[in-house]
């Protein structure tokens, strides 16, 4: 069995450099002079003057001693007698203080101190010499140990290679004893033959005690750089990996802590462990129940997996994700939860591991620890959740997690808020249950508050706005959410985000949110009063000019500005204006900004979605006679007639509606011809009675699943504005955190067509629109 001292070393392995030196002093029973422990070496003085080095003397203590010591009275004879005793024994007291080992056993020396707990003045004066004596003794012992080991090592090396396993066992015990003392430990690690013999013995023995002693020796050597190198050069890593299969706990513990030290501090160790099949062995050990053992094992996995795709795949193939998630569900030991969350964080950037962690219940398991007092654990869980969140939009049982995330939006820690907003953005994307849940737990108010508090911190505002955009469409609580943004004073700050210093990704998300908010008639006036319309038009003009400039320069490829295509901005702004134009006062403002020429020009766009929103906004504006005339005057009839034949039924339907409204004041025969044209165009595939079809709503569903941010994705954007410091265990720079991001363009519906007023009889029952090609609204870009 491993001794208590042996097993205590497991704790040290977590921070070997700091603890090793101290622990070896402790193991040798060296006396503590107070230098190492800082233990006080002074006591209150009987003189009543206190300690001259102490500023603050406890006078009550001094007075107490006076009263205690001298409450009885002495005769002159007694005083003289005591003085005589003290004078006679002065030399012995000095010797007792400085050289206690020279005293005869049982000899009684009267003390000058009444309280035995307090040292006398002589004892206090003797302390430096005692410390010096201990130092000299230690030095002599060290030299003796070194000499002894130097002489013993060649013979012990031979015995470790002996055929007689009994001799080998005894030699292993002796070497282990030597490895516990610093001087002899250094002698061992300086003998390559000895280290090789230890390694060979460890992996070849069938004897439990031999295995324990050799593994223990290597563990003791692993606290020193020289020892690590010696183990590495002697082929110790494959041998230690082999020992991970040992049924003996103490052997297992020694092996894993030694490997941990090698992985942390020895160059080349990671590759050697991987080649020796260490990853598979370590994953298999995750079903053990010793939390300290698991903490070291998971940290080894993190070191091996970090930045190494092959290792991540081996962990996956060995069943790592499920085992790691089980740990997060089962244990409460903070260090273990932290190291496990670090492994999951590293794995959560791997596209193969991501779904496996989610399937194993990783989201829910990580969510359990978001209210833990350990900030480092919470932060790791949040990073991991954010990385996983774009692959978890179809997960069930997320109620608890969503509730906690909404709470965390109120945190004072910027990193926590940033992550919580990002996760909520992803989890509310194309998942109506999650949207409803977030709304029910006060998510709208929390997100609005978050945006208000965030100011111009776009790493918070962008995901928060995206989450609000998702929550304000396509679920039963969407209308409530649209109202709630206004009721919680969110409209001014939302419109403000359309202005500098906002960057394009945030502007794009905000435009989408405004479009959804405009679905609620109660928001029309406030949005207008906040100046949303002129800004949307300004952004539209700018983005359109940008696309035109590139087209005129012969560019066919859509270009990205800050990860956003300008065509997306054109489409988004036009779409928002389209919905805002349902309000008569808004239509006047839109028309007053001289937008009709631009909308007409957009009908010529090669992008169907832009054609559709342009036709849509013109359809709304055409309700007003003057606008209809202005549209016709801009030459819209030709492109609109062309669009009647579009494969996209949304485009064709809007084009028909605009043309119909433009014909309001035309002669009857013109209307008749137009009606025939519209009928033949719109029902070219499946002619049917006007009154047999459903209403005109175009409910275009979600386009696709959210995509995690990837380095090769042109729209890749990191959540992080800066790097993070290194973690305590292993190296942990930022790179691994830049994983599945939130999705700025997610979750856009296309709303029903506008009420066509008196043209309704003609338009009733037009075929429902197809639900394809809605990239800007429905996909996660």
């Amino acid at each position: 069995m491993a001794t208590q001292a042996d097993l205590m070393e497991l704790d040290m392995a977590m921070e070997p450099d700091r603890k090793a030196a101290v622990s070896h002093w402790q193991q040798q029973s060296y006396l503590d002079s107070g230098i190492h422990s800082g233990a006080t070496t002074t006591a209150p003085s009987l003189s009543g003057k206190g300690n001259p080095e102490e500023e603050d003397v406890d006078t009550s203590q001094v007075l107490y001693e006076w009263e205690q010591g001298f409450s009885q009275s002495f005769t002159q004879e007694q005083v003289a007698d005591i003085d005589g005793q003290y004078a006679m024994t002065r030399a012995q007291r000095v010797r007792a203080a400085m050289f206690p080992e020279t005293l005869d056993e049982g000899m009684q020396i009267p003390s000058t101190q009444f309280d035995a707990a307090h040292p006398t003045n002589v004892q206090r004066l003797a302390e430096p010499s005692q410390m010096l004596k201990h130092a000299v003794v230690n030095l002599i012992n060290y030299q003796d140990d070194a000499e002894l080991a130097t002489r013993a090592i060649p013979e012990l090396t031979k015995l470790l290679n002996d055929e007689d396993q009994v001799v080998v066992n005894k030699a292993a015990v002796m070497v282990h004893q030597l490895s516990k003392k610093e001087a002899s430990r250094h002698a061992i690690m300086r003998s390559p033959q000895m280290v090789s013999a230890i390694v060979r013995t460890m992996q070849n023995t069938n004897d439990v005690e031999t295995a324990r002693c050799t593994a223990g020796t290597l563990h003791n050597l692993s606290h020193h750089r020289e020892g690590l190198l010696a183990i590495f050069k002697s082929g110790g890593i494959p041998a230690l990996v082999k020992m991970l299969g040992s049924p003996v706990d103490s052997v297992l513990f020694y092996a894993i802590t030694t490997l941990h030290n090698l992985l942390l501090h020895q160059e080349g160790a990671k590759m050697a462990v991987r080649l020796a099949g260490g990853l598979q062995k370590m994953v298999a050990l995750l079903n053990k129940t010793n939390v300290k053992f698991l903490a070291i094992t998971t940290d080894c996995l993190q070191i091996l997996a970090y930045g190494n795709q092959e290792s991540k795949l081996i962990i996956l193939a060995s069943g790592g994700p499920q085992a790691l998630v089980n740990i997060m569900r089962t244990y409460t030991y903070e260090k273990l939860l932290w190291t496990t969350s670090r492994v999951l964080k590293v794995l959560s950037v791997c596209s193969s591991n991501k779904p496996a962690i989610v399937e194993a219940g990783g989201m829910q398991a990580l969510g359990l620890h978001l209210t833990d007092p350990s900030q480092r654990l919470v932060q790791n869980c949040l990073w991991t959740l954010r990385n996983l969140s774009d692959a978890a939009t179809k997960q069930e049982g997320m109620e608890g997690l969503l509730g906690t995330l909404v709470q965390l939006l109120g945190s004072d820690d910027i990193n926590v808020v940033t992550c919580a907003a990002g996760i909520l953005s992803n989890l509310t994307c194309n998942n109506y249950k999650n949207k409803m849940m977030v709304c029910q737990v006060g998510g709208i108010e929390a997100l609005v508050r978050t945006v208000l508090r965030a100011g111009d911190r776009e790493d918070i505002t962008e995901p928060a706005i995206c989450a609000l955009r998702h929550l304000t469409s396509r679920h039963q609580e969407a209308e409530m959410a649209q109202n709630a943004v206004r009721l919680h004073y969110g409209l001014p700050v939302v419109v403000k985000l359309l202005h500098p210093p906002s960057h394009w990704p945030l502007i794009k998300a905000t435009v989408g949110l405004i479009r959804n908010l405009a679905l609620c008639p109660a928001n029309h006036a406030p949005l207008r009063e906040q100046g949303a319309i002129p800004r949307l038009v300004q952004l539209l003009v700018r983005a359109h000019q940008d696309t035109q400039r590139r087209t005129s320069m012969g560019g066919t490829q859509q270009q990205f500005v800050e990860g956003v295509r300008m065509e997306e901005i054109v489409e988004g702004c036009t779409g928002a204006l389209h919905i805002l134009a349902r309000d008569v006062h808004n239509r006047i403002v839109i028309r007053g900004l001289n937008t009709i020429p631009l909308f007409v020009q957009l009908l010529y766009s090669p992008i169907e979605n832009i054609q559709r929103v342009a036709a849509g906004v013109l359809c709304e504006l055409a309700q007003d006679k003057e606008a209809a005339e202005a549209i016709e005057a801009e030459g819209a009839t030709a492109p609109l007639t062309e669009l009647l034949h579009s494969r996209n039924e949304g485009v064709a339907t809007y084009a028909a509606a605009v043309l119909f409204r433009m014909s309001e004041d035309k002669p009857q025969d013109y209307k008749k011809r137009l009606s025939v044209e519209l009928t033949s165009s719109l029902f070219r595939t499946e002619p049917m009675a006007w009154n047999e079809t459903a209403d005109l709503g175009l409910d275009i569903g979600a386009q696709g699943e959210p995509l995690g941010y990837r380095q090769d994705d042109p729209s890749y954007r990191s959540f992080h504005s800066g790097g993070y410091g290194q973690d305590a265990l292993g190296m942990d720079p930022m790179m691994e955190h830049e994983m599945g991001g939130h999705h700025p363009g997610a979750d856009y519906p296309v709303d029903g067509l506008p009420d066509l007023g008196h043209a309704q009889d003609l338009m009733d029952g037009l075929p429902p629109g197809d639900s394809n090609q809605l990239a800007w609204f429905d996909t996660d870009l």
């Epitope: 002894l148 080991a149 002489r151 013993a152 090592i153 060649p154 013979e155 012990l156 031979k158 015995l159 007689d164 009994v166 001799v167 005894k170 030699a171 002796m174 030597l178």
Partner: nanobody, 118 residues
Framework: QVQLVESGGGLVQPGGSLRLSCAAS????????MGWYRQGPGKQREFVAS???????NYAASVKGRFTISRDNAKNTVNLQMNSLRPEDTGVYYC????????????WGQGTQVTVSS
């Protein structure tokens, strides 16, 4: 240095028995192993059997079940009872004492010849 003296070797027919003894002279500290090794004609010296001062015995696979090792700590002797001898058991049998001190010391006897032949 401890002196080791072996005795009991000789010629024996296959299937026969022999008892080897080894006596150690001098002071022997505890934590030691006394054992027997042998060297066949044209072969390397190989381990046969050993016993610790706490009576923990160990045997080579080739002799397990046929040979028995025992020791008398008071007399500092070790005995090897060899039964069912085979021709391949032929060789010089050496007594070895390993004292596990810092540094360890190994002492060898002069050896005694055992011949198994019909």
């Amino acid at each position: 240095q401890v002196q080791l003296v072996e005795s009991g070797g000789g010629l024996v027919q296959p299937g026969g028995s022999l008892r080897l003894s080894c006596a150690a002279s001098g002071t022997i500290s505890s934590n030691n192993v006394m054992g027997w090794y042998r060297q066949g004609p044209g072969k390397q010296r190989e381990f046969v059997a050993s016993v610790t001062d706490s009576d923990l015995a160990n045997y080579a696979a080739s002799v397990k079940g046929r040979f028995t090792i025992s020791r008398d700590n008071a007399k500092n002797t070790v005995n090897l009872q060899m039964n069912s001898l085979r021709p391949e058991d032929t060789g010089v049998y050496y007594c070895r004492l390993t004292i596990m001190t810092y540094p360890p010391t190994i002492s060898w006897g002069q050896g005694t010849q055992v011949t198994v032949s019909s």
